[in-house]
Amino acid sequence: MADNFSLHDALSGSGNPNPQGWPGAWGNQPAGAGGYPGASYPGAYPGQAPPGAYPGQAPPGAYPGAPGAYPGAPAPGVYPGPPSGPGAYPSSGQPSATGAYPATGPYGAPAGPLIVPYNLPLPGGVVPRMLITILGTVKPNANRIALDFQRGNDVAFHFNPRFNENNRRVIVCNTKLDNNWGREERQSVFPFESGKPFKIQVLVEPDHFKVAVNDAHLLQYNHRVKKLNEISKLGISGDIDLTSASYTMI
């Protein structure tokens, strides 16, 4: 399930000077470099989590500059220009703004943490080159985290870090079709730590999802649900404090 390819490889098709995988050119922006907060809209929505917002302000130690995490985020509707100077995105693959579905307070209200479980709508489905970014902090004594890319009642991609499965830490990936779970794919590399901030990035590729955590490539998961346009929601749950969830096209 893991591989040695990176986002850079995926986009350029060439060798990658950063063997760790997902390059720092877009990964670890300095806080002063600017960023792309997702657009937001005010008001609470029936059936959605209570007021929260993203782009949220990144918690201490998180990854400023990643999509959706913008230290000192401006009021909703205020949109800074593209980053420049150190950490700016390369022009060849500059990410766009992040798609956003917060339920914020009044205009200008400070962003707060998102309520978990949280649903990020993907109303147009997913498409190759879509990058989904989740920022948060693992709770102390955490047991599990789960990302569920949902297609109606099915789960196209279930990403499930387990902190204590028979005294082992393991990441389980699977697909649920017609209420039946398929064959599990297990990954023993486990980059999450209780009490620590994290950044999960999921890049949609034509035939697989590619997952990086804290800017290091972790795994890929071949598409079992082929109709990507029907994957209409990302459910985020588990023992985390969630700061932001957003997407961008790269």
Epitope: Y41, S96, P123, G124, N153, K227
Partner: antibody, heavy 115, light 107 residues
């Protein structure tokens, strides 16, 4: 083939409510968000809101949050939009449309508010 | 809210001409742009989505391009049946918004 069949035209009194329906066929109803769009005579298109038929999660345009209520009946693959406290400003054609990019549209339901 | 601006309300053209209709978003909408055609008394019809992907059954004379805030619908050789209203739309961030429309008419 994908079809969205909307209910017939409505003539209603000011202050009343109306319930519009959109019956989906030709695809898996729960796999796509359903949008509702308003178009006043001679005017452009306004997004009212959307609902996920798999779990009834809704998102509304703030302009319509006290006007429209979106619901679904999963068993019959029907999406509904209730419009309340109607005024002449609500006279319009209302469309249902599937998916974020709205790839298939209903034929529209004309709502006329008149005393 | 994201504002989608179609600066040309009316565009005059002739059959066989190439015409480009533009749409500018008030912020980056990351190619989540669709284009619709609407004729009088009819529902809108999707032409293109993800800025450049042609919807099923749409003739290949319709093409789309753009990224960031600027998007274009091009009809390579206008046919009589293309005379209609054209709307752009973003489904990037709610409320989803439409441009005000561009009417394509014969000179």
């Amino acid at each position: 083939q994908v079809q969205l069949q909307q209910s017939g035209a409505e003539l209603v009194r000011p202050g009343a409510s109306v319930n519009l329906s959109c019956k989906a066929s030709g695809y898996t109803f729960t796999n796509y968000w359903m949008n509702w769009v308003k178009q006043r005579p001679g005017q452009g298109l306004e997004w009212v809101g959307m609902i996920d038929p798999s779990d009834s999660e809704t998102h509304y345009n703030q302009m319509f949050k006290d006007k429209a209520t979106l619901t679904i009946d999963k068993s019959s693959s029907i999406a509904y939009m209730q419009l309340s406290s109607l005024t002449s400003e609500d006279s319009a054609v209302y469309y249902c449309a599937r998916w974020g990019a709205m790839d298939y549209w209903g034929q529209g339901t004309s709502v006329t508010v008149s005393s | 809210d994201i504002v989608m601006t179609q600066s040309h309300k009316i565009m005059s053209t002739s059959v066989g001409d190439r015409v480009s209709i533009t749409c500018k978003a008030s912020q980056d909408v990351s190619t989540t742009v669709a284009w619709f055609q609407q004729k009088p008394g009819q529902s809108p019809k999707l032409l293109l989505y993800w800025a450049s992907t042609r919807h099923t059954g749409v003739p290949d004379r319709f093409t789309g391009s753009g990224s960031g805030t600027d998007y274009t619908l091009t009809i390579s050789s206008v046919q009589a049946e293309d005379l209609a209203l054209y709307y752009c739309q973003q489904h990037y961030s709610p409320p989803f918004t439409f441009g005000s429309g561009t009417k394509l008419e014969i000179k």
